[in-house]
Amino acid sequence: GSERTCCPVNWVEHERSCYWFSRSGKAWADADNYCRLEDAHLVVVTSWEEQKFVQRHIGPVNTWMGLHDQNGPWKWVDGTDYETGFKNWRPEQPDDWYGHGLGGGEDCAHFTDDGRWNDDVCQRPYRWVCETELDKASQEPPLL
């Protein structure tokens, strides 16, 4: 496929990545699917600098990111290693609160109103951020 060299319309370029910030709210799985359909993924935060960039754009509203532990350990949706990577949890989070009886605790991570991270029930209707990398081969077939 051809390489993406500039961001799509209504996406914001930052450090060789493109970001799209939702205004509406969706459950985590619906948000994840939305990003995939855009040939992107829920945002993966790899540095304090990227954290600050995203925080500036989302404001004080709970916002899903591409981090979950629905299959056990915490995982980033793009395969970035969680254990060795950047983290910005609120104090005493993630707490994986099991009281809701959904069977898996609080399995999805979101930015809170102060930007720090919390884990919550994945069905909550929060905003979300999609990210795609520039110079990444797109899924479109090359022009003949």
Partner: antibody
């Protein structure tokens, strides 16, 4: 003190339209999500719609989807519910209620309600 | 949609009694459960949110508990002003849904 005052209710024929208003005071209106909830005579509470603090997100009950529109004017501290194609089953007391946060944190403050009667 | 089932639908109690109302949800709702009190001809009043957190100004005789799909509202010592209808509500996701209500009457 925090106050919500609904207006615009009345008697209307089936198929006609009505617009409800909710005037807010005593808090920073533009920081809070707002909801409409209704109660048919002698029945329980039914959630109708929500609009987030900045108007960016709106959700509706299936029973009113496509007929009712929730909106807000933050400069006027006012919430609205435009009700079209009214049916007899829309007869109810309509309450506006403040969300505890931007729109997904539950209800805390309620207005006194305005009565809508749909009858021919 | 998430279904909310309250029980009992009505109960008779005396002043000073301890009253318990239950709310069962059709699926887990996290901690996103609220309780409301409504008196005839009046607007609902918020009592509790996030299962057990008291709204400002609500007396501590009201308490909430539960997890998973089963939740409870308890009034520790019923007073004359507590005779009303009580509703539970989930706000985990849209559409928000209410229980059918429990009417607390004087015995």
């Amino acid at each position: 003190q925090v106050q919500l005052v609904e207006s615009g209710g009345g008697v209307v024929q089936p198929g006609r339209s009505l617009r409800l208003s909710c005037a807010a005071s005593g808090f920073t209106f533009s920081s809070y999500g707002m909801h409409w909830v209704r109660q048919a005579p002698g029945k329980g509470l039914e959630w109708v719609a929500v609009i987030w603090y900045d108007g960016s997100n709106k959700n509706y009950a299936d029973s009113v989807k496509g007929r009712f529109t929730i909106s807000r004017d933050n400069s006027k501290n006012t919430l609205y519910l435009q009700m079209n194609s009214l049916r007899a089953e829309d007869t109810a007391v309509y309450y506006c209620a403040r969300d505890q946060g931007v729109g997904y944190d539950g209800l805390d403050v309620w207005g006194q309600g305005t009565t809508v009667t749909v009858s021919s | 949609d998430i279904q909310m089932t309250q029980s009992p639908s009505s109960l008779s109690a005396s002043v000073g009694d301890r009253v318990t109302i239950t709310c069962r949800t059709s699926q887990g709702i996290g901690k996103y459960l609220a309780w409301f009190q409504q008196k005839p001809g009046k607007a609902p009043k918020s009592l509790l949110y996030k299962v057990s957190s008291l709204q400002s100004g609500v007396p501590s005789k009201f308490s909430g508990s539960g997890s998973g799909t089963d939740f409870t509202l308890t009034i520790s010592s019923l007073q004359p002003e507590d005779f009303a209808t009580y509703y539970c509500q989930q706000y985990m996701t849209y559409p928000l849904t209410f229980g059918g209500g429990t009417k607390v009457e004087i015995k």
